[in-house]
């Protein structure tokens, strides 16, 4: 069975979050997709969405968020550039399928942004999460205001027993620190 999990990314201010959400391409290839933030006890808030119908590998930029939908692969790429401490939070990808409720994709992303020391000795200058180039074409897409009350979530369990960390032999120094946490609904 598919488990709903969280993946935790710990990044510094100014870096870039670069993630992907996969979906069933036969069902959702051209459906409109969105990137949402979930604040405890609140309804998810849509921050950016693809066009409707979603265009293949056509970047859509809304502020510091770039979405790119690879239809033929069933992958939505999400980049949040120039991260700020206040970007910290829980995020998810959803697929709009009106009149039905949005379809939530796996996994959720727990983003933790901390103050950085860019440019000072010892700073992680070559972190891949700093990499960002402006896509050749960007478009602003209008997102439906519809959010489903059913996707309101509780905070994940605080128990550390269910936290699995990446394999010990992987050096995550220049990747990103990721922790998978099962989410129980």
């Amino acid at each position: 069975a598919t488990k709903l999990t969280e993946e935790k990314y710990e990044l510094k201010e100014g870096q870039t979050l670069d993630v992907k959400c996969d979906y069933t391409l036969e069902k959702f290839a051209s459906s409109q997709k969105a990137w949402q933030i979930i604040r405890d006890g609140e309804m998810p808030k849509t921050l950016a969405c693809t066009e409707r119908p979603s265009k293949n590998s056509h970047p859509v930029q809304v502020g510091r968020i770039i979405l790119e939908d690879y239809h033929d692969h069933g992958l939505l790429r999400v980049r949040m550039v120039n991260l700020q401490v206040e970007d910290s939070g829980l995020y998810q990808c959803v697929i709009y399928q009106p009149p039905k409720e949005p379809h939530m994709l796996f996994d959720r992303i727990r983003l933790v942004v901390t103050k950085g020391f860019s440019g000072t000795p010892g700073s992680n200058e070559n972190s891949t999460q700093n990499v960002y180039k402006i896509p050749p074409t960007t478009t602003k897409a209008l997102c439906p205001l519809y959010t489903s009350p059913r996707t309101v979530t509780q905070a994940p369990p605080k128990s550390t027993a269910d936290v699995s960390t990446p394999d010990s032999e992987i050096n995550l120094t220049n990747v990103t620190d990721i922790i998978r946490v099962p989410v129980f609904n």
């Epitope: 598919t2 993946e7 692969h73 992303i109 891949t128 990499v131 699995s164």
Partner: antibody, heavy 123, light 107 residues
Amino acid sequence: QVQLVQSGAEVKKPGASVKVSCKASGYTFTSYDINWVRQATGQGLEWMGWMNPNSGNSGSVKKFRDRVTMTRDTSISTAYMELSSLRSEDTAVYYCVRLIGYSSAWKWSFQHWGQGTLVTVSS
Amino acid sequence: DIQMTQSPSSLSASVGDRVTITCQASRDISKYLNWYQQKPGKAPKLLIYDASNLETGVPSRFSGSGSGTDFTFTISSLQPEDFATYYCQHYDNIPITFGQGTRLEIK
């Protein structure tokens, strides 16, 4: 330690199908995407596609889209790649590969490789 | 699709030599580039990820640099076990593609 163990060599006739298995151990199978890469004898590496073992979703390059099926059995931590309508050009070593980062990361760095499965297509 | 062009396609060198291989992308791929080593009859091995980061356990004589379209892979002092074929691979977008490979032979 992370290990990907693939099924043995296969000889197939043109038009037939082949199903290669890839058994994972040493990590949580559903946490990392599995990719498939092939290499014809004396040739370079060719990416075929990916599969997320947690969701079961997969994607493949246009060249293979109508012929390849990627599946998994999470109960035995095994991924499968089936290629149909085989032709002589499909003769190659097929590798299953695990990425460096978790499924959600846009990090297509092929860190752990299976030993490869030689598929020979000949009449 | 992004084309990755490696040069040279083959190279002869001696133990102790400094060796450089280049990889050129058909368009800007930022730092989304990896390097692999493959020995005959074996699976490839990840050496460098994100253009310049050394994979855990890989000797420090291997290094990578570059960004945008031009990348360089260097072995500072060639060892007998380094004779192999080397591949670059981009992941700036889908589909992922590899260079055609550089075969490093003993002179």
